[in-house]
């Protein structure tokens, strides 16, 4: 056909525009062309022809009569993206074709999964909080906003800023706590992140801090420490930067630190440490424990010959360390440690508080008072100095080695040793069963050293033999049992001194009361055999003219001899025991006078004694029948007070002829004693027993009573 004059080639009068559209949404790419004849329109994407409903009725793309390309829904997957690309429309007629400008079709996208979900944040109030979020991938690039507890946050508040996915709260408050959600948004829609919790905690703060305290020893003390914070802080205590030692301290529910009975070792700095997840605070206070003065070593009465030197010890302790000074009773003159000695003075006080008087004169006799003084109190102790011309109270003879119990054979030879010393030198004689021995029996002789020898032994020689050492200063005896049998040894074992322990050192007096003396000593010199126990012997001119054994089976090297007379001078010596026998005696102690009964014991508060005794709780155990006539009584004590001299075991018959007879007493005179044996009881009788603590004339509460029935015969094994 030929060209018509009015025909003209196509020209695009409406070009398609770039478009961003959400997946699944409809959209149109516009294209309008003019031309005669009316041009046909075709669309190309990325250079390839686009199929429309004209090609496939099932296509989701439709070519509209106007030439526009209409998409029923934009198809766009993770990988296949058939609708995205660069489009042109081409208008054609027989005169030519016109191509539109490129129009890009981009698919808006907003994925579900956030590149970075905000995470839980814990901050301390006042600190900044930052919540970070990267929205899901999307096109156009999503913007974000934040919601707190599902309500959009207004970032106009000056504390809050949102920058590049970060929510920043500059100065957090408790009210900022909550659930925060980051919302990513673009034209596709919105996506909520997983919520993140902002927790605003509060650092520990002190409502009440511990305060410095000064207390007396044995008083209770409390350090308070009240804290607040969120979460509730844990509270712990330290002493001098170290953990509290176990057992001494109570920590109450409100974190108060309590010490029931303070000791000087409790002094120091106590720190209360409050800690929670967001902080730690410390507050400290010092404890000063004032210990009233106490005597470590009291001065004791001394008897000293003229011209000699005497030292009265007076060692004290306390906090602060007590100031010690001395004065003679009746004198205004005070003597202090480290005082420059006066030209004619014979008295001086050592730095530790000991008073020394040199070149003793008769006028020095009297009472000397040691006083110890601190802000926490004062104490004093008196000691008497007696001055003699010479020490007239010479002790009776001392038997160094006495006879030993032995079993010998008929026709054998017995050697009963007896070696004595003294001033003047004693004479040794022997008794058998209390009668002079050997008489005229030619088989028995007393040898030069005092040993009794008996030859050709007979069974009738069996008995108790006593060696008696006599001098003008008194007499001392020592007994042993000789048992003559058919099967014994033929001759006495001659105990060598090397088989026996060495003699202990001279006993030192460490404490004196009206009825007791506390002695301490050292074991025998190294190289000698060890002792398994000790015995203590005492002598007093006013009590008897011989040495008395006042303690047996003593296991320690410190012992209190009880049951002594008041205001009486005593001498003591100690022997060591091992299975082979007894050692030589120790050197004699210095003379020691027990306290007088009349003045009350210095430094003892009677109300305190009575109070402490009242607090003692004695728990009596079930008595144990040892033999038909002996019962062992044992007890325990809940609190061992300072003032206790011993325990009175009280017992009475509650069956038989003398039922509910009066109480009989047995005193256990050692404060540490926890058992006693009742002897000479009646067989097959019920006894009621109780125990009572005592100190001087003061008595504590009785234990509960227990009953026990003695057996008719010895208990079977």
């Amino acid at each position: 056909s030929r060209l018509r004059q009015e025909d003209f080639p196509p020209r695009i009068v409406e070009h398609p525009s770039d478009v961003i559209v959400s997946k699944g949404e409809p959209t149109t790419l516009n294209c309008k062309a003019e031309g005669r004849p009316t041009p046909t329109i075709e669309w190309y994407k990325d250079g390839e022809r686009v199929e429309t409903d004209k090609d496939d009725p099932r296509s989701h793309r439709m070519l509209l009569p106007s030439g526009s390309l209409f998409f029923l829904r934009i198809v766009h997957g993770r990988r296949s993206k058939p609708d995205e690309g660069s489009y042109v429309c081409v208008a054609r007629n027989y005169l030519g074709e016109a191509v539109s400008r490129n129009a890009s079709l981009e698919v808006a996208l907003l994925r579900d999964d956030f590149r970075q979900n905000p995470t839980d944040v814990v901050v301390a109030a006042g600190e900044p909080a930052i919540l970070e979020c990267q929205p899901p991938r999307g096109h156009p690039e999503p913007t974000i906003y934040w919601k707190k507890d599902k309500v959009r946050i207004d970032d106009k508040e000056e504390r809050i800023s949102i920058r590049g996915g970060k929510l920043m709260i500059s100065n957090t408050r408790k009210s900022d706590a909550g659930m925060y959600t980051c919302v990513g948004t673009n034209m596709v829609g919105e996506r909520d992140s997983d919520p993140a919790e902002l927790t605003v905690f509060e650092r520990p703060t002190f409502l009440r801090r511990p305060i410095n305290q000064v207390v007396l020893e044995e008083e209770a003390v409390e350090f308070r420490c009240q804290v607040q914070g969120d979460p509730q802080p844990t509270v712990r205590w330290k002493k001098d930067d170290a953990d509290l030692p176990r057992g001494r301290y109570d920590i109450k529910d409100d974190y108060t630190l309590r010490i029931k009975k303070t000791m000087s070792t409790d002094e120091g700095t106590y720190m209360c440490i409050a800690e929670n997840r967001v902080g730690k605070m410390e507050a400290s206070a010092t404890l000063t424990v004032r210990a009233p003065p106490q005597f470590v070593v009291r001065p004791r009465d001394q008897i000293v010959a003229q011209g000699r030197t005497v030292t009265f010890p007076c060692e004290t302790k306390g906090n602060p360390q007590p100031a010690v000074f001395w004065q003679k009773e009746g004198s205004q003159n005070l003597l202090f440690p480290n005082q420059p000695q006066q030209p004619n003075s014979r008295c001086s006080v050592s730095p530790t508080g000991d008073l020394t008087i040199t070149n003793i004169q008769r006028s020095d006799a009297g009472y000397y008072i040691c006083q110890a003084l601190t802000v926490a109190g004062s104490i004093l102790a008196k000691a008497q100095l007696e001055v003699t011309d010479v020490l007239t109270d010479r002790p009776p003879p001392i038997i160094l080695q006495g006879p030993a119990n032995q079993t010998l054979a008929v026709d054998g030879t017995a050697l009963l040793k007896c070696k004595a010393t003294g001033d003047p030198l004693p004479v040794i004689s022997w008794l058998k069963e209390g009668f002079t021995f050997p008489g005229r029996d030619p088989r028995a002789t007393i040898q030069e050293q005092g040993t009794l020898q008996i030859k050709n032994l007979r069974i009738s020689d069996t008995g108790t033999y006593t060696c008696v050492a006599t001098s003008s200063s008194g007499e001392t005896s020592w007994s042993a049992v000789l048992d003559v049998t058919e099967s014994g040894a033929t001759i006495s074992k001659n105990y060598d001194l090397s088989d026996l322990p060495g003699p202990p050192s001279k006993p030192q007096v460490t404490d004196v009361t009206k009825n007791s003396v506390t002695l301490s000593w050292q074991p025998g010199t190294p190289g000698t055999l060890p002792a398994s126990a000790y015995i203590i012997e005492a002598f007093s001119q006013s009590v008897s003219n011989s040495w008395q054994t006042v303690a047996n089976h003593v296991k320690t090297t410190l012992y209190t001899v009880r049951g002594l007379r008041p205001n009486t001078i005593y001498l003591f010596m100690v022997r060591a025991i091992n299975p082979q026998g007894l050692s030589d005696p120790s050197p004699m102690s210095d003379p020691v006078r027990t306290q007088d009964i009349s003045p009350p014991a210095q430094g003892v508060d009677h109300r305190q004694v009575q109070k402490e005794l009242g607090d003692v709780l004695v728990r009596l155990h079930n008595p144990v029948v040892l033999t038909p006539t002996t019962v062992q009584v044992t007890w325990t004590v809940d609190r061992q007070p300072q003032f206790i001299q011993g325990y009175r075991v009280m017992y009475r018959q509650t069956s038989g002829l003398q039922a509910t007879s009066s109480w009989q007493n047995l005193d256990a005179k050692v404060p540490t004693e926890r058992s006693a044996v009742l002897v000479n009881l009646k067989k097959g009788v019920t006894y009621e027993i109780k125990v009572r603590p005592y100190f001087n004339e003061f008595q504590g509460m009785d234990s509960e009573s227990k009953t026990v029935r003695t057996t008719e015969e010895a208990p079977s094994a």
């Epitope: 990325d46 390839e48 199929e51 997957g77 296949s80 058939p82 579900d112």
Partner: antibody, heavy 118, light 105 residues
């Protein structure tokens, strides 16, 4: 009509290679990813990988890496799958499948039986 | 790789029965899950995409549900032409489940 037509059955010896073709028609070939899936006798479906016809990018699961090659010829709208070093357990029906914009395999080829036997 | 576990591996049912097949992903795949039907000697056919969207031309007795890790294909009233093997597929990593064979009781 949108369809995928695959090449015919093959019998191969162990150690040999096989190349299966898949001719696409009725749609814009470069607009949709092409996948290959195989099914051994009596077994389930096993995905072997994809090719983006627009740029030739490919991705394979670990199992097939180094042994499978996927190519395309946009001028004839055909995709190819080449499997080398054949073993008897490679005996299977091999399918090509188009991935729609909805991330699903909406159009499948009829399948190509490959038998590996000595 | 995300593993897909399908259950049961086979089931017997009668025409008119309601049939449920489940598919579990080893980790969350949001809604990226498809269901296919395959009859012996034929290529698989897409039934459901994006967990619950019905492919055009598929009868409405087929429905899908679930998101995250647990998904279900339900045939509300089994028809004779529905006896086949059904596969789930996650479209993140494109792996298939092991299949469920629906047989006539």
């Amino acid at each position: 009509e949108v369809q995928l037509v695959q090449s015919g059955a093959e019998v191969k010896k162990p150690g040999a290679s096989v190349k299966v073709s898949c001719k696409a028609s009725g749609y814009t070939f470069t607009g949709y990813y092409m996948h290959w899936v195989r099914q051994a006798p009596g077994q389930g479906l096993e995905w072997m990988g994809w090719i983006n016809p627009k740029n030739g990018d490919t991705e394979f699961p670990q199992k097939f890496q180094g042994r499978v090659t996927m190519t395309r010829d946009t001028s004839i709208t055909t995709a190819y799958m080449d499997l080398s070093r054949l073993r008897s357990d490679d005996t299977a029906v091999y399918y090509c499948a188009r991935e729609s914009g909805d991330d699903a395999f909406d159009i499948w080829g009829q399948g190509t039986m490959v038998t590996v036997s000595s | 790789d995300i593993q897909m576990t399908q259950s049961p591996s086979s089931l017997s049912a009668s025409v008119g029965d309601r049939v449920t097949i489940t598919c579990r992903a080893s980790q969350s795949i949001s809604s990226y899950l498809n269901w296919y039907q395959q009859k012996p000697g034929k290529a698989p056919k897409l039934l459901i995409y994006a967990a619950s969207s019905l492919q055009s031309g598929v009868p409405s007795r087929f429905s899908g549900s679930g998101s995250g890790t647990d998904f279900t294909l339900t045939i509300s009233s089994l028809q004779p032409e529905d006896f086949a093997t059904y596969y789930c597929q996650q479209s993140v990593g494109l792996f298939f489940g092991g299949g469920t064979k629906v047989e006539i009781k």
